[in-house]
C-alpha cells in the first residue's frame, strides 16, 4: 500500500515513515499490515483468500497377480513399466470413476511379490469451510472402492478375467494427507500483535480476515459520524468535530452542539 | 506401446480358406496375443488367444476352424481360418496385452492394444 508526497515536506516525510515502512523517493512503502501517509494507519481488512482447491493423497499398497514382476518394472523409463502404468491407471480409472474428488493415481514404486504396487490416490475439491468432511467421505470411498474390486478381481484357476487381478490380502491404506487451509490460523498470523482483534468471516462461502473496522460484516464496529481506527488496545472511534457540533462516546454517538458550550462559556465570563 | 499392423483379408467364397497375419513393432514374446473381429453392426468379440506361453483359446463360433499361432522371431500372429462361412464376414482386428501379462485364458480385458484391422467378406 502507498501514498503518494508531493512538495518541499517529502524529505522530512522519508524519515518519519513508520511501522517498517521505506521511503522510495516519492512516499512511503507500506508494510503489508499498514497503510497512510506515513503507514500509520493499520488496514482493517488481510486478504487471505483460500486456495480455489484443496488436495488430499492417500498412500496405498495393491498386489497385482495378473502381471509377472521384472526387474524392468524397477526402470520408470522401460516399456515394461510405461505399459504397466497406462494399465494400472486405466484399471484405477475405472475402479473410481464415481468418485467427483478423484484425480488419478501415481505409481511411486514396484517391487516383487506378484506385483507390489505403491501409489498414492490423489484427490482435489473446491474450496469450501466444508472441504475436510467432502475429503474424508472421498477417501472412505475410495478405500471401499479398491477393497471391492480387489476382492472381486482375483485369479481363479490361473485365469484372469479382467484387465487385471489382485491379492485380495495385499491391499492396505498406508497414509493419508490432506492439505491444511486454516483461515483463522492464517488470519491470526497475518494479523501480528493485532491478532487478537481480527476475526473471519464468511461472506458466500468465502473467508475474510477483518477487524471491527472495517464496514459491513456482523462485528463491523458503527463509529457513526466518526473514523474506526485500530490500536495495539484494540479499535477505537475517532470522534470528528464540525462547525456545529463536537462528538464524543464510544462510538461517537453523543453530540454536543457548540453554540450551547460557547453560551456557556460567555455567561461565566 | 506396440504398434499392430494387419494384412491378408480379402474377398471369399463360403468353404474356401484364409489367412490373416498381423506384424507386430515389438516383441511379442512377452505377450498375450489375440485376433478379435466385429461384424457390421454388431459388438466386436473375441475369436482366439495365445498366451505367451503358448496356450492358445477359440470362441465356440470358430473351434476347429480357425488356428492362432505366432512366430516370435519374425514378431508375428497369425489366423488360419478354414471352411468360411458367411457369418465370418468382419473386420479382423489383432491385439496384444501389454508385457508379461499373465492369466491370458480369456478374450477379453486382457488386449489392450489393437491394429487397424482387415477386412473379410465370405459370399459366393
Known amino acids: 500500500r502507498t501514498t503518494t508526497c508531493f512538495g518541499d515536506g517529502c524529505q522530512n516525510t522519508a524519515s518519519r515513515c513508520k511501522n517498517g515502512g521505506t521511503w522510495d523517493g516519492l512516499k512511503c512503502q507500506c508494510p503489508n499490515l499498514y497503510y497512510g501517509e506515513l503507514c500509520e494507519e493499520v488496514v482493517s481488512s488481510i486478504d487471505i483468500g483460500p486456495p480455489e482447491t484443496i488436495s488430499a493423497q492417500m498412500e496405498l499398497t495393491v498386489t497385482v497377480t495378473s502381471v509377472k514382476f521384472t526387474e524392468e518394472l524397477k526402470n520408470h523409463s522401460s516399456q515394461e513399466f510405461q505399459e504397466f502404468k497406462q494399465t494400472f491407471t486405466e484399471q484405477m480409472n475405472i475402479v473410481y470413476s464415481g468418485i467427483p474428488e478423484y484425480v488419478g493415481v501415481n505409481i511411486t514404486k514396484l517391487r516383487l511379490g506378484s506385483v507390489v504396487v505403491e501409489h498414492d490416490v490423489l484427490l482435489r475439491t473446491k474450496y469450501t469451510p466444508e472441504y475436510k468432511t467432502v475429503l474424508d467421505n472421498a477417501t472412505e470411498v475410495v478405500k471401499e472402492k479398491i477393497t471391492k474390486v480387489t476382492t472381486q478381481q482375483i485369479m481363479i484357476n490361473d485365469i484372469c478375467s479382467d484387465m487385471m487381478c489382485f491379492n485380495t490380502t495385499g491391499t492396505q491404506v498406508q497414509n493419508i494427507t490432506v492439505t491444511q487451509y486454516d483461515p483463522e490460523e492464517d488470519c491470526r498470523k497475518m494479523a501480528k500483535e493485532y491478532g487478537d482483534y481480527f476475526v473471519v468471516e464468511y461472506r458466500d462461502q468465502k473467508p475474510y480476515c477483518i477487524s471491527p473496522c472495517e464496514p459491513g460484516f456482523s462485528v463491523s464496529k458503527n463509529c457513526n459520524l466518526g473514523k474506526c481506527q485500530m490500536s495495539l488496545s484494540g479499535p477505537q472511534c475517532l470522534c470528528v468535530t464540525t462547525e456545529t457540533h463536537w462528538y464524543s462516546g464510544e462510538t461517537c454517538n453523543q453530540g454536543t452542539q457548540k453554540s450551547l458550550v460557547y453560551g456557556h462559556h460567555h455567561h461565566h465570563h | 506401446e506396440v504398434q499392430l499392423v494387419e494384412s491378408g483379408g480379402g474377398l471369399v467364397q463360403p468353404g474356401r480358406s484364409l489367412r490373416l497375419s498381423c506384424a507386430a513393432s515389438?516383441?511379442?514374446?512377452?505377450?498375450?496375443m489375440g485376433w478379435f473381429r466385429q461384424a457390421p453392426g454388431k459388438e466386436r468379440e473375441g475369436v482366439a488367444g495365445i498366451s505367451e506361453d503358448g496356450i492358445t483359446i477359440y470362441a465356440d463360433s470358430v473351434k476347429g476352424r480357425f488356428t492362432i499361432s505366432k512366430d516370435n522371431a519374425k514378431n508375428s500372429l497369425y489366423l488360419q481360418m478354414n471352411s468360411l462361412r458367411a457369418e465370418d464376414t468382419a473386420l479382423y482386428s489383432c491385439?496384444?496385452?501389454?508385457?508379461?501379462?499373465?492369466?491370458?485364458?480369456?478374450?477379453?480385458?486382457?488386449?489392450?492394444?489393437r491394429g487397424q484391422g482387415t477386412m473379410v467378406t465370405v459370399s459366393s
Open positions: 515389438g516383441d511379442i514374446t512377452r505377450r498375450c
Open positions: 491385439a496384444a496385452s501389454i508385457l508379461n501379462r499373465v492369466g491370458c485364458r480369456q478374450l477379453s480385458y486382457e488386449y489392450i492394444y
